[in-house]
Interface confidence: low
């Protein structure tokens, strides 16, 4: 009796399953009790001897390329051996490499975590991923793994991490680079300082009081809100950073606490309150403000 080894599929792609079948064309295996064993080169595969004429291999890799055969043994200890079959495992070269960021869009707050995710649309086997900083290419890290994506993490982003990044994927067919991704580091506003500026030391009713609010740190644009007690007076924008001012024509109702808030979309910070009180100087006919 003759024995054949059939691999299905016969030309597998890396990562895909393969079924090996040990066939006896002129003998029904049910006619006699057989045990089967599958080999690659000189090594037995799977469970060794088994009553099943099939062996399922869950995933084939490039290194599984080789010469396979099977043996069948009867109860009478007669051993049949198949001819060798060459199985070539096909590797798919990496293609369509892309670099994405988490958070998306490449905008990240100072101190936050930034993840650079390198992905390939196709590619099999062990893929080496490499991350580079700057168009010139300072190598940051490399990882080799059997997956289509890999991550490089900056746990706490600093201002100096604002740069262009790219990644390269390679699985034996030459490196394939991604496009450049720009990282913008957004800096939250610091607590603003509110200054009250009047045309004279003792501001009087109808004087123009300037409320100047400034956050010393923070990515522009910065929106400043001005408050009297809990009431919004208005807002001013500082498109390029720096401070902003709000003018008030003074009346008696302007006594009380003033504060301002700076907001650049990364959370808001409120200033300490500045208290403005009316005082009536002895012998004076008009009210004056003191802060």
């Amino acid at each position: 009796a003759e024995l054949f080894l059939i691999a299905s599929p016969s030309h597998p792609t890396e990562g895909s399953p393969v079924t090996l079948t040990c066939k006896m064309p002129f003998l029904q295996s049910s006619d006699a009790q057989f045990q089967f064993c599958f080999f690659r080169d000189t090594r037995a595969l799977g469970p060794g001897w088994s009553s099943s004429p099939k062996l399922q291999i869950a995933a084939m890799w490039k290194e599984d390329t080789g010469s396979y055969w099977c043996e069948a043994q009867t109860m009478a200890s007669k051993v049949l051996r198949s001819r060798r079959s060459q199985i070539n495992v096909h590797r798919v070269p990496v293609a369509d490499v892309s670099l994405e960021t988490q958070p998306p869009g490449g905008q990240v707050m100072e101190g936050d975590r930034l993840v650079l995710i390198c992905s390939v649309a196709m590619g099999t086997g062990d893929i080496t991923f490499l991350w580079y900083k700057g168009a010139v290419g300072l190598n940051l890290q490399s990882k080799t793994q059997r997956s289509l994506t890999a991550e490089y993490e900056i746990p706490s982003v600093r201002e100096s991490d604002a740069e262009q990044y790219y990644c390269v994927a390679e699985n034996g067919y030459g490196p394939s680079p991604s496009g450049l991704v720009s990282i913008t580091v957004r800096i939250p506003v610091s607590r603003p300082i509110l200054m009250l500026r009047a045309p004279r030391a003792q501001a009087a009713v109808e004087d123009v009081l300037e409320l100047h609010c400034e956050a010393l740190r923070g990515s522009p644009p910065i929106l400043y809100w001005f408050y009297h007690e809990d009431i919004t007076l208005g807002s001013r924008s500082a498109p390029s950073g720096g401070g902003a001012s709000f003018n008030l024509s003074l009346t008696e109702e302007h006594s009380g606490n003033y504060s301002c808030e700076a907001n650049n979309g990364l959370g808001a910070q409120r200033s300490e309150a500045v208290t403005l009180n009316f005082t009536v100087p002895t012998g004076a006919r008009s009210n004056h403000l003191t802060s």
């Epitope: 809990d230 009431i231 907001n263 959370g267 409120r270």
Partner: antibody, heavy 117, light 112 residues
Framework: QVQLVQSGAEVKKPGASVKVSCKAS????????MHWVKQAPGQGLEWIGR????????KYNEKFKSKATITVDKSTSTAYMELSSLRSEDTAVYYC??????????WGQGTLVTVSS | DIVMTQSPDSLAVSLGERATMNCKSS????????????LAWYQQKPGQSPKLLIY???TRESGVPDRFSGSGSGTDFTLTISSLQAEDVAIYYC????????FGQGTKVEIK
Amino acid sequence: QVQLVQSGAEVKKPGASVKVSCKASGYTFTRYWMHWVKQAPGQGLEWIGRIDPNSGGSKYNEKFKSKATITVDKSTSTAYMELSSLRSEDTAVYYCTRVNSGAMDYWGQGTLVTVSS
Amino acid sequence: DIVMTQSPDSLAVSLGERATMNCKSSQSLLYSSNQKNYLAWYQQKPGQSPKLLIYWASTRESGVPDRFSGSGSGTDFTLTISSLQAEDVAIYYCQQYSNYPTFGQGTKVEIK
């Protein structure tokens, strides 16, 4: 979209305390102050107090100063109001509400607190 | 505290007719520095949370039908529903935010 989701109804005995939560989503929690409003059964709306989630600073209606304590947890974008020494007149629906330039533009669904022996 | 007084307490209007309600504050709500009136109007339907309709006395909140309008300045304010719809049955509250917030007692709007 902006959402304020409050904790469920509570039944408490006189003298007990209750803590109502209000989880905010869909906006930057620290940008907007959060107010709490009481509505007794069949009655109108009464302001309890407010908190600035950014600084944690709070202010109260004089009437509720010894009754309510408002706090926030910035990490979970949640505001809380604790009512202490509960009495039958504290039975009401309590709302959290976000304030935008003074006006209360988004409201929670309300939490009914029933005080009964 | 600023006291807000609404009138009438209840109002019955036919569908498609105009509904007008008033709100009076014990102090002026007009803030001289920005010429804004610190007053809002809310609608509360049975079993629901209040909903902001109008702020700055006359600015309609996004998504609010244009049949709702607010007017007035200083201490006297009006909310008008130009053509009452069945879904407008509710209690309407005015609220000042010139100081720590206070609400009017509400005006109940029903269909005649």
